[in-house]
């Protein structure tokens, strides 16, 4: 039962994270939550950084600055892969949740 619950939590978190991405950067509250998660967990996107390509409000050569290894204003514009965290947040934060919840 514990595993089923954990999988359900992960699935919900994945869906919620992707939903919040759709509102980025239009919703300031959403943006600050996502930015905080990406910066704190050193991750980018849900499955990986390429998820940001699919967000209509984001230029395809851009990820949020919070994805950058060294966060500075504009660092996510015209990004180079070597300068950003490539791992997705769902797996990374999920791993943390599994250990700590």
């Amino acid at each position: 039962a514990g595993y089923v619950f954990r999988d359900k939590v992960m699935s919900e978190f994945n869906n919620n994270f992707r939903q919040q991405m759709e509102n980025y950067p239009k919703n300031n509250h959403t943006a600050s939550i996502l930015d905080r998660m990406q910066a704190d967990f050193k991750c980018c996107g849900a499955a990986n950084y390429t998820d940001w390509e699919k967000i209509p409000s984001m230029s395809k050569n851009r990820v949020p600055d919070s994805c950058c290894i060294n966060v500075t204003v504009g660092c996510g514009i015209n990004f180079n892969e070597k300068a950003i965290h490539k791992e997705g947040c769902v797996e990374k934060i999920g791993g943390w949740l599994r250990k700590n919840v």
């Epitope: 990986n48 390429t50 390509e53 230029s59 395809k60 050569n61 851009r62 504009g74 660092c75 514009i77 015209n78 990004f79 180079n80 892969e81 070597k82 300068a83 490539k86």
Partner: antibody
């Protein structure tokens, strides 16, 4: 020193195919996005395609999408452009171009390889 | 897509002249603007990146300025080797990567 050397150009009939290669040396290939940029005779520069460091991201100009395919072999430090359904307006010099991205410009260009599409 | 428009399309000048080429973007591109020089039969060469930063090895007579939508490339004192075609290019929002149509600098 840093070098980009294109090959594979030539004369091809309309509807034909060609594969361009770009052999690189003198730098860490995986640190860079790579581009193909072309220039038709007497015309300006036209971006064709780019590929990210790992190859996860690939984009194409509208004029070539569905006909051209960009790829890279990071073990061989090489970039490729597979061109099919070639048309007369694809006739151009094709340049392999290194791109550090972010605020920096496309800093190293190959010498170019000429593709001529004609019957 | 962001369009880049250069002016003039061609320009005649003499050795020692001060020359300015302008580039306008169809929307703001911050400072994500690069300038290239191309000589006949040769590959383009990066001169200026980020609107105003001089690429390593490029003579200091070349300078760039501007941000947002309007940019300029200035050659303070033309040398014989500067007669070439110059292109601007934006990297703020891609794909596509877009270039200006070019400015041909000729000897008067």
């Amino acid at each position: 020193q840093v070098q980009l050397v294109e090959s594979g150009g030539g004369l091809v009939k309309p509807g034909g195919s060609l594969r361009l290669s770009c052999a690189t040396s003198g730098f860490t290939f995986t640190d860079y996005f790579m581009n193909w940029i072309r220039q038709a005779p007497g015309k300006g520069l036209e971006w064709v395609s780019y590929i990210s460091n790992s190859g996860s991201i690939r984009y194409y100009a509208d004029s070539v999408r569905g006909r051209f395919s960009i790829s890279r072999d990071n073990a061989k430090n090489s970039l490729y452009l597979q061109m099919s359904s070639l048309r007369a307006d694809d006739t151009a010099v094709y340049y392999c171009v290194r791109d550090p991205r972010q605020i920096y410009g496309m800093d190293v260009w190959g010498q170019g390889t000429t593709v001529t599409v004609s019957s | 897509d962001i369009q880049m428009t250069q002016s003039p399309s061609s320009l005649s000048a003499s050795v020692g002249d001060r020359v300015t080429i302008t580039c306008r973007a169809s929307q703001s591109i911050s400072s994500y603007l690069n300038w290239y020089q191309q000589k006949p039969g040769k590959a383009p060469k990066l001169l200026i990146y980020a609107a105003s930063s001089l690429q390593s090895g490029v003579p200091s007579r070349f300078s760039g300025s501007g941000s947002g939508t309007d940019f300029t490339l200035t050659i303070s004192s033309l040398q014989p080797e500067d007669f070439a075609t110059y292109y601007c290019q934006q990297s703020y929002s891609t794909p596509p990567i877009t270039f200006g149509q070019g400015t041909r600098l000729e000897i008067k």
